[in-house]
């Protein structure tokens, strides 16, 4: 550990006299003190040198001797006090910064130790410290507040009474920040935003911190903007403003916008993108295939997406038919705002009867012009079988109509005894008919197909069978031949009612 | 000790605009905040904004914003308020105020005498 | 913006008997245990001068009949003993935030 000469704790002098600290250490030594004027440093190896012939009230201080080189890194001090009658206070720092809750050092020196008993702490201006202040004091270092609170963010002076007067040292602000918990909080506002060549626009870019030490840019495709900022305190934070206004866009404005903010915890930044446009502009479009087709009864929801600028000024969905003249019903239809910019228009269609296949078509307008959207609803039905017995060209002929869609595939079956219908044990022959003739097939409706079996002999102890299915369901219709004639049996398990 | 002198009496017809002066004494001037209050006749005060001289930061208040500047010139130790676009209403004396205590001034504890501006017609 | 409503809007007091005012404000004014909230005093033709700060702490030079109380919305002003000199308009004021607002004030008169 070095030693410093004289070997005191501390040296008490008067103004304008000489003082010299040596130190003597095993290695090379340092001297580390207050920075005050006058002091001549001599070093010559293991020992160090420190004087002054001309003392001053600001050489008050603690002076430290270090050894480098020591890995215990021991050190040794001697506190210095130039008593000046006119001055009882050195102080080192006329500005103090710390966190809420730390201890804040306010370091006034006090020159003469026996002032020591006279000392308080005052506001500038002679004002009282504010209730709750703990504090102590140290000739060596000055008073100290504990735990520092944000409304002890004052300017502070050291009193001493010299001769039954109070002396006051020059003042110390104490600024108290608050806890930064991170960065300062961004917004930007719009988030996105879109303009016509010659239009007035307006980016707002504004951070805040519960601490005031924070810096904020806007910078448009990373290029810093100079713009006025607006400060305020609000909700015991502090808000900084930046408004960039554009009376006339042009197309060197638009692009990438980022608002920037910093403070000592780190940075944060957001952007946004700016788009000028030559026009007004309307774009319809729809994830959903514009043809759709559902089982009757079932629902369905249509959603057209909606990108426009300027906004629009009206829209709506029309029922085109074929079917009726009814229109949706305002409340089956829903807007949902995406963005500024993009919006979703939905038509609910809640269990859909027969009359309600046919066209959709959703219009909308704004400055731009009209746009319209159209969707093609056709119905999916189960088929509907019917049969009945005929001659044709002098043939006995079984002839199946079965109606639905998709178009139905109809299959004949022939099976032993009188029944409802066919099972697998009763089977005697079975017929596939890929080319019924279609008798009717107009968009939105159904599709109606007929099947004819030529029968030379009808058996009457048999059961002819017509079938027909398709992606909805399948019907089917049996007819037994009876000896006063043709009988037949719609299945009692089909009953359909739409 | 801090004293706050405001400039005389202002009297200006509606549309115009009216500056007063704050000059400021026995304090350094760069290192406080000045804030602005006024007060309509018979009515009480409302704060208008706030200028630190030291940067020049300012603080205005939202419904004053556009219609009111603040301005420093420290070589002179002196405060400017600049209220534009002025109509009948606001009519009334106007203070400038500080606390002279920190940098952040949580009260107003010195004040000056106050201007009193007409708008009339 | 914080609003203080200050009541009631004028009082009547005998010469050394007690005088409450009372100000609410719109939302809390506390931070970290401090009541950012602040009474003066204004007569005539004159600018008004602080009372109290931080609701309860009294200014350099004002006489110890004055006091201050409160936390998060509700603060009193209390003059102990109603003195001539006291006949005045009082207002509280937060510096909670800015804008920084008054109340509406209240007119203390002599019964």
């Known amino acids: 550990i070095p030693v410093i000469e004289p070997s005191v704790p501390e040296l008490v002098v008067k103004p304008g006299a000489t003082v010299t600290l040596r130190c003597v250490g095993n290695g090379s030594v340092e001297w580390d003190g207050p920075p005050s004027p006058h002091w001549t440093l001599y070093s010559d190896g293991s020992s160090s040198i420190l004087s002054t012939n001309n003392a001053t009230f600001q050489n008050t201080g603690t002076y430290r001797c270090t050894e480098p080189g020591d890995p215990l890194g021991g050190s040794a001090a001697i506190h210095l006090y130039v008593k000046d009658p006119a001055r009882p206070w050195n102080v080192l720092a006329q500005e103090v910064v710390v966190f809420e809750d730390q201890d804040a050092l306010l370091p006034c020196l006090l020159t003469d130790p026996v002032l020591e008993a006279g000392v308080s702490l005052v506001r500038v201006r002679g004002r009282p410290l504010m209730r709750h202040t703990n504090y102590s004091f140290s000739p060596w270092h000055g008073f100290t507040i504990h735990r520092a609170k944000f409304i002890q963010s004052q300017d502070y002076q050291c009193s001493a009474l010299m001769g039954g007067r109070k002396v006051m040292s020059i003042s110390i602000r104490l600024k108290v920040q608050k806890v930064i918990p991170g960065p300062p909080a961004l917004t930007l506002v719009p988030a996105e935003l879109v303009r016509i060549r010659g239009e007035a626009a307006q980016i707002v870019c504004s951070a805040s911190s519960v601490d005031v030490n924070f810096d904020v840019f806007l910078q448009h495709n990373n290029t810093k903007l100079a713009i006025p900022q607006q400060s305020d305190f609000h909700n015991n934070r502090y808000q900084k403003v930046l408004t960039l206004n554009l009376d006339q866009v042009d197309f060197q404005h638009a692009g990438n916008y980022s608002c920037v903010a910093s403070n000592v915890q780190g940075k944060h930044s957001t952007s946004m993108f700016f788009r000028v446009v030559e026009s007004a502009y309307l774009n319809l479009s729809s994830e959903q295939n514009l043809i759709q087709e559902v089982t009757v009864g079932e629902g369905l929801n249509l959603k057209v997406m909606v990108e426009a600028y300027p906004g629009l000024q009206g829209f709506n969905w029309t029922y085109l038919g074929p079917f009726s003249d009814h229109q949706p019903e305002p409340k089956l239809a829903n807007a949902t705002t995406k963005d500024t910019y993009r919006h979703t228009f939905t038509l609910s269609l809640p269990r859909l009867k027969p009359s309600e296949a046919g066209r959709y078509s959703f219009l909308a307008r704004n400055p731009g012009g009209w746009r319209a959207l159209t969707f093609e609803l056709t119905l999916r039905y189960p088929p509907e079988v019917s049969v009945i017995w005929t001659f044709i060209n002098g043939s006995g002929t079984l002839l199946c109509a079965a109606s639905g869609y998709p178009q139905p595939n109809v299959t004949w079956l022939q099976c032993s005894g009188h029944t409802d219908r066919c099972d697998e044990a009763q089977v005697l022959q079975v017929w596939d008919d890929p080319y019924p003739e279609v008798l009717s097939q107009e968009p939105f409706h159904k599709v109606t197909v007929q099947s004819l079996l030529t029968v030379e002999t009808l058996e009457h102890n048999q059961t002819y069978e017509c079938r027909a299915h398709n992606s909805v369901g399948s019907g089917s219709w049996a007819f037994i031949p009876i000896s006063a004639g043709a009988h037949t049996h719609p299945p009692d398990e089909f009953l359909f009612t739409p | 000790q801090v004293q706050l002198q405001q400039s005389g009496a202002e009297v200006k017809k509606p549309g115009a605009s009216v500056k007063m002066s704050c000059k400021a004494s026995g304090y350094t001037f760069t290192s406080y905040w000045i804030h602005w209050v006024r007060q309509a006749p018979g009515q009480g005060l409302e704060w208008m904004g706030a200028?630190?001289?030291?940067?020049?930061?300012?603080n205005y208040n939202q419904k004053f914003k556009g219609r009111v500047t603040l301005t420093t010139d420290t070589s002179a130790s002196t405060a400017y308020m600049e209220l534009s676009s002025l109509r009948s209403e606001d009519t009334a004396v106007y203070y400038c105020t500080g606390a002279f205590a920190g940098y952040y001034d949580w009260y107003f504890d010195v004040w000056g005498q106050g201007t009193t501006v007409t708008v009339s017609s | 913006d914080i609003v203080l409503t200050q009541s009631p809007d004028s009082l009547a007091v005998s010469l050394g008997e007690r005088a409450t005012i009372n100000c609410k404000a719109s939302?809390?004014?506390?931070?970290?245990?401090?009541?950012?909230m602040n009474w003066y005093q204004q007569k005539p033709g004159q600018p008004p001068k602080l009372l109290i700060y931080?609701?309860?702490d009294l200014d350099s030079g004002i006489p110890d009949r004055f006091s201050g109380s409160g936390s998060g919305t509700d603060f009193t002003l209390t003059i102990s003993s109603l003195q001539a000199e006291d006949v005045a308009t009082y207002y509280c004021q937060q510096s909670y935030e800015d804008p920084r607002t008054f109340g509406g004030g209240t007119t203390l008169e002599i019964k």
């Open positions: 939302q809390g004014v506390d931070y970290a245990g401090d009541s950012y």
């Open positions: 931080v609701a309860s």
């Open positions: 200028i630190y001289p030291g940067n020049r930061d300012t």
